[in-house]
Structure formats: C-alpha cells, structure tokens
C-alpha cells in the first residue's frame, strides 16, 4: 500500500491557511469536494464541501472555512479564516465520486496553530462578506456526506498552501511565513 | 425502503465470544455515503457506540471495547457482523446496528434490536 | 471521552405543554472552523430502536415533526417539545460525535 504522508503547517492564531489542492481537470472538475479533518482512531469528519455539481469559482463558506472550485486550474482551493489554537489537526480534501470511494486529492495537512502575533491581519467577518454562505437551514441534501476511508492506492499529488487575507487572489507560489516539514507515516 | 436486521444467538456463555451480524436489505452496504455501526443497550440502561466500519473494511472502535471488538463487512451478502470476545454478564445487552451519516456521527437509521444474554 | 450528561432523569408534562430536557457535554461539541455542534438527540419508545430527531444540535430529521426542535451550543444544550402529544411518551438521549462518540443516560418522558 502506499504510504501517506503529511506536510505540516505552523501558522499563528488569526492568520488565515490557503491550500490549493490539484485534481486532474477532464475527470473531476464538477464532482463536489470536500474538506475534512481526521482525528486519531476516529472517522474522517467532513467539515465543509461544495456544491453537486460544483460550481466554477463560486465559494461557499462554512463558518471560517471557504472553499473555492477552479475548473479552468484544476484546482479547489480551501481557506481557514482566522485560525484558532483549536484549529490544529489533521485535514485533507477529497473528491466524492459515489459510488466508488472518495478520492484524497492530496497528502495530508498537519495544521499547528500556535497563540502569538500574527504577521498578516486577522480576518473578520467583513473581509468575507463577497463569498455565498451556506444558510443555517442547511440540510443532509446540501452536503451529502460520502465517506472517505484511510486507505490511498496511488500516490495523490501535492499541494501548495498561502498565509494571506481571505480576500487575496489565486497564488500558487507566494509562500510566506510558513514552515513545511514533511512527515512520513 | 432500506432496513436492518440483526441476528445471532441469544444466550452467550461467560468467557466465549459474542457473534452477530446485521443485514442489510432494501440498499446496498456498499454505499459510499456511510458507516454501518453497533451500539449496545443493557437492560433498563443507557446506549453505548461499540463501533462501526465502512464497506471497504475501515473499522473504528470504542477504546474502552476496543481490545474484546472485531467488526467486519461481507459486501457479497450484504451483511456486516460484530464480535466481542471474553464476555462477561456485564455484556448483557440489547444490541443494534444501525446506519451512521459520514462525517457526522449520528446514526439516522436503526435495526430493531436483538437481546444477547451472557450466563453460565 | 467526552461525558453527555442529561437532566432531568424523568420528567411528566401534560398533555399540550411544554417539554424541556437539557443535554451538557463535558467537554465543547462545538467546531468553530465550520461552526456546528456535532451533537443528535434520538426519541426510543419501550420495545423500540431509537430514532433520529435532530442533528447538528438543531436540523430536524426528515420527517419529525415540528414540534421537536433542539438549540444550545459549545456544552450546553436543550431539546424543546414544544406541546407533547400522547405518542411523544419515550425516553430521549443526546449523542455527540465531536471526539469520539458517547450517550448521555436518558430522560423519561411521561404524561403528567
């Protein structure tokens, strides 16, 4: 079996993470994503996922979670809005492909929220406003929850993660403030 | 109309192990949009999640079951079945199956039950 | 494990009034990143399988009625009848899922 292996992330509370996760466009590109988080010897909790179909560069919020599906880049891109020390843990996105089983789209983010200043401003309410949130009737119907089980047959492809304000533009290569640190299962 | 039903013997000897097993009719087990998981209910007592497991085999237990529990999925047959080993009159239980939504635990769907006894 | 503790343990209400059972976790069921309680309220009748009311602390289930309606956040959380009817006579038990998954022990439900 291929091994999994996590990129680990050490952000301050109040920064924002930005992770593009690639999918392969032509097979994928409308099928609803997703993102979860994954806590030891539990099952993997879907926190937030796009529509069915997803929509091309329309963002969906969830509380602090935004995700934003580009077709044209073959990319979802996932934000986490002013990071809480609680935020810590394990996420990965996935593809929902019922009836076969979802497919992770990348290695796993190891998120470490730490207290202390944060270099870039902290996001608020306001800097969200332009995204469609998700109203608080949501039902099952909005977010059908299709498992993602722990077990990978082929290697998923990488990912690249920003700290910036939520309302920044797609950057797949300003990496700031961030320390990556592989880890290998 | 999807619906569970769970099976097994009725009286367990202490020491020996639990077996049952739930089908799954109306529906196919091998649904990616959820779990299949057991939860017990002793006698005039409260409901305890002994664990539950995907049609590809991932499995998540209690802790405090963990080491005694095995749950396995035959997708042929549409079952999944539970065994719990070295049991003990404390294990006296009804117990369920149920149908548990992905990535929020809850369990929207529940078999009626069966009484397992464990005594000598 | 996260402890659900559940009060009353009984409780009798006439027929049309209100219910009131009160579910505290011991630790938050809260996620702040998406903002949902992961916590469920279940209805069991004597001789029944539990049933499914409401989810993410206030989402009724397909199909119950409106009467029943859950509210509360982070530890502290109610599930309202709001006028009880002679088939809502059962005891109710809160679930979370958050870390791990646990019951709290139940409130009986009876008519007064």
């Known amino acids: 079996a291929t091994k999994l292996t996590e990129e680990k992330y050490e952000l301050k509370e109040g920064q924002t993470l930005d992770v593009k996760c690639d999918y392969t466009l032509e097979k994928f590109a409308s099928s609803q994503k997703a993102w979860q988080i994954i806590r030891d010897g539990e099952m993997p909790k879907t926190l937030a996922c796009t529509e069915r179909p997803s929509k091309n560069s329309h963002p969906v919020q969830v509380g602090r979670i935004i995700l934003e599906d580009y077709h044209d880049h073959g990319l979802l891109r996932v934000r986490m809005v002013n990071l809480q020390v609680e935020d810590s843990g394990l996420y990965q996105c996935v593809i929902y492909q019922p009836p076969k089983e979802p497919h992770m789209l990348f290695d796993r983010i190891r998120l470490v929220v730490t207290k202390g200043f944060s270099g870039t401003p902290g996001s608020n309410e306001n800097s969200t406003q332009n995204v469609y949130k998700i109203p608080p009737t949501t039902t099952k119907a909005l977010c059908p929850l299709y498992t993602s089980p722990r077990t990978v047959t082929q290697a998923p492809p990488k990912s690249t993660a920003d700290v910036s304000t939520p309302d920044s533009e797609i950057n797949l290569t300003n990496v700031t403030d961030i320390i990556r640190v592989p880890v290998f299962n | 109309q999807l619906q569970l039903q769970e099976s097994g013997p009725g009286l367990v000897k202490p020491s020996e192990t639990l077996s049952l097993t739930c089908t799954v009719s109306?529906?196919?087990?091998?649904?990616?949009?959820?779990?299949w998981g057991w939860i017990r209910q002793p006698p005039g007592k409260g409901l305890e999640w002994i664990g539950s497991?995907?049609?590809?085999?991932?499995?998540y237990y209690n802790p405090s079951l963990k080491s005694r529990v095995t749950i396995s999925v035959d997708t042929s047959k549409n079952q999944f079945s539970l065994k719990l080993s070295s049991v003990t009159a404390a294990d006296t239980a009804v117990y369920y199956c149920?149908?548990?939504?992905?990535?929020?635990?809850?369990?929207?769907?529940w078999g009626r039950g069966t009484l397992v006894t464990v005594s000598s | 494990d996260i402890v659900m503790t559940q009060s009353p343990d009984s409780l009798a209400v006439s027929l049309g009034e209100r219910a009131t059972i009160n579910c505290k976790s011991s630790?938050?069921?809260?996620?702040?990143?998406?903002?949902?309680?992961?916590l469920a309220w279940y209805q069991q009748k004597p001789g029944q399988p539990p049933k499914l009311l409401i989810y993410?602390?206030?989402t009724r289930e397909s199909g119950v009625p409106d009467r029943f309606s859950g509210s509360g956040s982070g530890t502290d959380f109610t599930l309202t009848i709001s006028s009880l009817q002679a088939e809502d006579v059962a005891v109710y038990y809160c679930q979370q899922d958050a870390t791990g998954i646990t019951f709290g022990g139940g409130t009986k439900v009876e008519i007064k």
């Open positions: 497991i995907y049609y590809s085999g991932s499995t």
């Open positions: 149920a149908r548990q939504e992905y990535g929020d635990g809850y369990f929207d769907l």
């Open positions: 630790q938050s069921v809260l996620f702040s990143s998406n903002n949902k309680n992961y």
């Open positions: 109306g529906g196919s087990i091998s649904s990616s949009s959820y779990y």
């Open positions: 993410w602390a206030s």
